[in-house]
């Protein structure tokens, strides 16, 4: 006997009624007196509801189940489960026996939406840039366990220190509390997104923090206008300076370097001491120069992934900030040239010349020229592939019809370093072989 149930779990909200669909195909002349229908919990075999000897035997499951008795004769063996609870979640088996028997299991997935998060800020008074605050996002009575995400005002993920706890109440519903510990910048919006993975429902909460300003005005912070260019593997200095007033002491200084976009903390100096690097231990301040207003940051062993904007926050009585861009670069290697075919070449033959240059950054510009430096307008295909470190290998292929003889040059330009790497191949005589013997 073939018994049909839905393949996908039945999703039911806590407190609502759910229908666990089950059907069979009755033969002509079928009467309910012939039917034995049993619903049971798949794992424990606990009886949930049964219909035998032509009668509904009723619910064996807290009086919360019912059959569609008027539809049974048409093969509808579905079960109605009322006032769904978290504890109902799981697999239910529908057994149908007439002359023969069949069974199938249907999954019930229980869900409950999370409440709109409430946000609390501690401390919530007299906040300054450089202060560490704790933001708590609380959302209640959801199911199943939530996924929690923190974002800034632009929707970028916040990578501060996050601790999330979820506690089930007596009904099995979860209360979620997520705590973000973050160092304040000049101002900012902090958003918490509580996602119900079953309902794909997001509950949002947010808080905007504007730290205290001084009546005496902002601190003026200077950074270079142009991007700082640094070679991969070398050290870079992101310059930042402020003008200390007479009597200034480092105990009054809050200095924060952070990634401009994500607000990720890079390095900080607060409460009169260097709090150290929060960026893979590759940053350092010029501590002996801080008191003179030098807030520059040293970034060691620069990587491609470091490229971007860094913000320097300086807070004394009041605060000021400025962003400096780091442009990462790596020189391209001298190109290696290959020629195909490379034997028995005649004028009029079509050849493919490949120019390969390695481990540069950013992406290169590639130019082909003849022996006189005039651009070659043959068929050129250039591809650039980044390796795990983000450095590019460039391969440029020139397809050209040979003249009597000629020089073909490839120029690989690094647009940031304005550095050109040259390679060339000269093809002479006929017949000719490459490389020359």
């Amino acid at each position: 006997l073939e018994v049909q149930v839905p393949e996908d779990p039945v999703v039911a909200l806590v407190g609502t009624d759910a229908t666990l669909r089950c059907s069979f195909s009755p033969e002509p002349g079928f009467s309910l007196a012939q039917l034995n229908l049993i619903w049971q919990l798949t794992d424990t075999k606990q009886l949930v509801h049964s219909f035998t000897e032509g009668r509904d035997q009723g619910s064996a499951y807290a009086n919360r189940t019912a059959l569609f008795l008027d539809l049974l004769a048409q093969g509808n063996a579905s079960l109605r489960l009322q006032r769904v609870r978290v504890a109902d979640e799981g697999s239910f088996t529908c057994f149908v026996s007439i002359r023969d028997f069949g069974s199938a299991a249907v999954s019930l997935q229980v869900a409950a939406p999370y409440s709109k998060p409430s946000m609390t800020l501690e401390p919530n008074k007299d906040l300054r840039p450089g202060d560490t605050v704790t933001i708590t996002c609380s959302s209640y009575r959801g199911y199943p366990e939530a996924e929690v995400f923190w974002q800034d005002g632009q929707g970028a993920p916040l990578t501060g220190n996050v601790t999330t706890s979820q506690m089930a109440n007596e009904q099995g519903l979860f209360d979620v509390h997520s705590v973000l510990r973050v160092v304040l910048g000049a101002n900012g919006t902090y958003s918490c997104l509580v996602r119900n993975p079953v309902l794909q429902q997001d509950a949002h909460g947010s808080i905007t923090i504007t730290p205290q300003r001084s009546p005496t005005g902002a601190v003026e912070v200077q950074v270079p206008e142009d991007p700082v260019v640094a070679l991969v593997g070398t050290d870079a200095t992101l310059r930042c300076s402020f003008s200390p007033e007479p009597g200034f002491s480092l105990a009054q200084l809050n200095l924060i370097w952070q990634l401009t976009d994500t607000k990720q903390l890079v390095h900080s100096f607060t409460e009169g001491r260097d709090q150290g690097s929060a960026y893979a231990n590759r940053t350092a301040l010029f501590l002996d120069l801080l008191a003179q207003g030098n807030a520059s940051l040293r970034l060691q062993r620069v990587r491609v992934a470091d490229e971007g904007s860094f913000t320097c926050f300086v807070s004394i009585r009041d605060f000021g900030s400025a962003a400096v861009s780091l442009q990462v670069a790596a020189p391209y290697s001298k190109p290696s040239m290959t020629l195909e075919p490379n034997k028995d070449l005649r004028p009029g033959d079509t050849v493919t010349i490949t120019c390969s240059s390695y481990r540069g950054y950013p992406e290169a510009e590639v130019f082909w020229q003849d022996g006189q430096g005039a651009p070659l307008t043959g068929n050129v295909t250039t591809s650039q592939m980044a390796n795990e470190q983000g450095l590019f290998d460039v391969h440029s292929v020139l397809r050209v019809v040979l003249g009597a003889n000629g020089t073909y040059s490839c120029l690989v330009r690094n647009p940031v370093l304005q550095q050109d790497a040259h390679g060339s191949v000269t093809i002479t005589g006929q017949p000719m072989t490459f490389p020359p013997e």
């Epitope: 401390p123 007299d126 708590t136 205290q212 009597g247 009054q252 009585r317």
Partner: antibody, heavy 116, light 107 residues
């Protein structure tokens, strides 16, 4: 509601040490620095130092660097101050108070008496 | 350390009177000054921070002013429950330092 609970009194002998406690409730313990303040009878207030319960980072008033040691127990939301080599000069009321720049909640204070 | 000088050391005022207490600092602390009230046998309570911001729940007859090195606490319409010692405290530098206190009594 926010509460900082301190024992009412401690009596100790000169030369001994004592560990004063401050149990916090009603807020996130790791979100606020805990400060300790000394007040001698009919005298002013002296800031001893403070501790960040999150990572146990401390700052001390130089005058108390060799006298006081601040610790926390996050699991019980309790801050402690150990005072060593006690003399009659250490007899005072010691308060715990939460905050960085403003001390918005204070404990009731522990009266420390150093006497033989 | 920043020195805090509070004056007067004590004063008596009648109910309904206006009282002013001043606090001088040894160096510029901008606006980072707080005032605390301590009643006999009790712990101090925050009244005002950032020189002029009234703490939640504090009666509006209390007000603060000043910046730099000179600050004042004003109590309009003195009430019997205002009998206490008042302390100023700088929050500009570590160590935090307090004024010597002003004992306010009812006349």
């Amino acid at each position: 509601q926010v509460q900082l609970q301190q024992p009412g009194a401690e009596l100790v002998r000169p030369g001994a040490s004592v560990k004063l406690s401050c149990k916090a409730s009603g807020y996130t313990f790791t979100a606020y620095w805990m400060n300790w303040v000394k007040q001698r009878p009919d005298q002013g207030l002296e800031w001893i130092g403070r501790i960040d319960p999150y990572d146990s980072e401390t700052r001390y008033n130089q005058n108390f660097r060799d006298k006081a040691r601040l610790t926390v127990d996050k699991s019980s939301s309790t801050a402690y101050m150990q005072l060593s080599s006690l003399t009659s000069e250490d007899s005072a009321v010691f308060y715990c108070a939460r905050g960085v720049r403003i001390f918005d909640y204070w404990g009731q204070g522990t009266t420390l008496t150093v006497s033989s | 350390d920043i020195q805090m000088t509070q004056s007067p050391a004590s004063l008596a005022a009648s109910v309904g009177e206006t009282v002013t207490i001043t606090c001088r600092t040894s160096e510029n602390i901008d606006y980072t000054l707080a005032w605390y009230q301590q009643k006999p046998g009790k712990s101090p309570q925050l009244l005002i921070y950032n020189a002029n911001t009234l703490e939640d729940g504090v009666p509006s007859r209390f007000s603060g002013s000043g910046s730099g090195t000179l600050f004042s606490l004003k109590i309009n319409n003195m009430q019997p429950e205002d009998t206490a010692t008042y302390f100023c405290k700088q929050a500009y530098d570590v160590p935090r330092t307090f004024g010597g206190g002003t004992k306010l009594e009812i006349k």
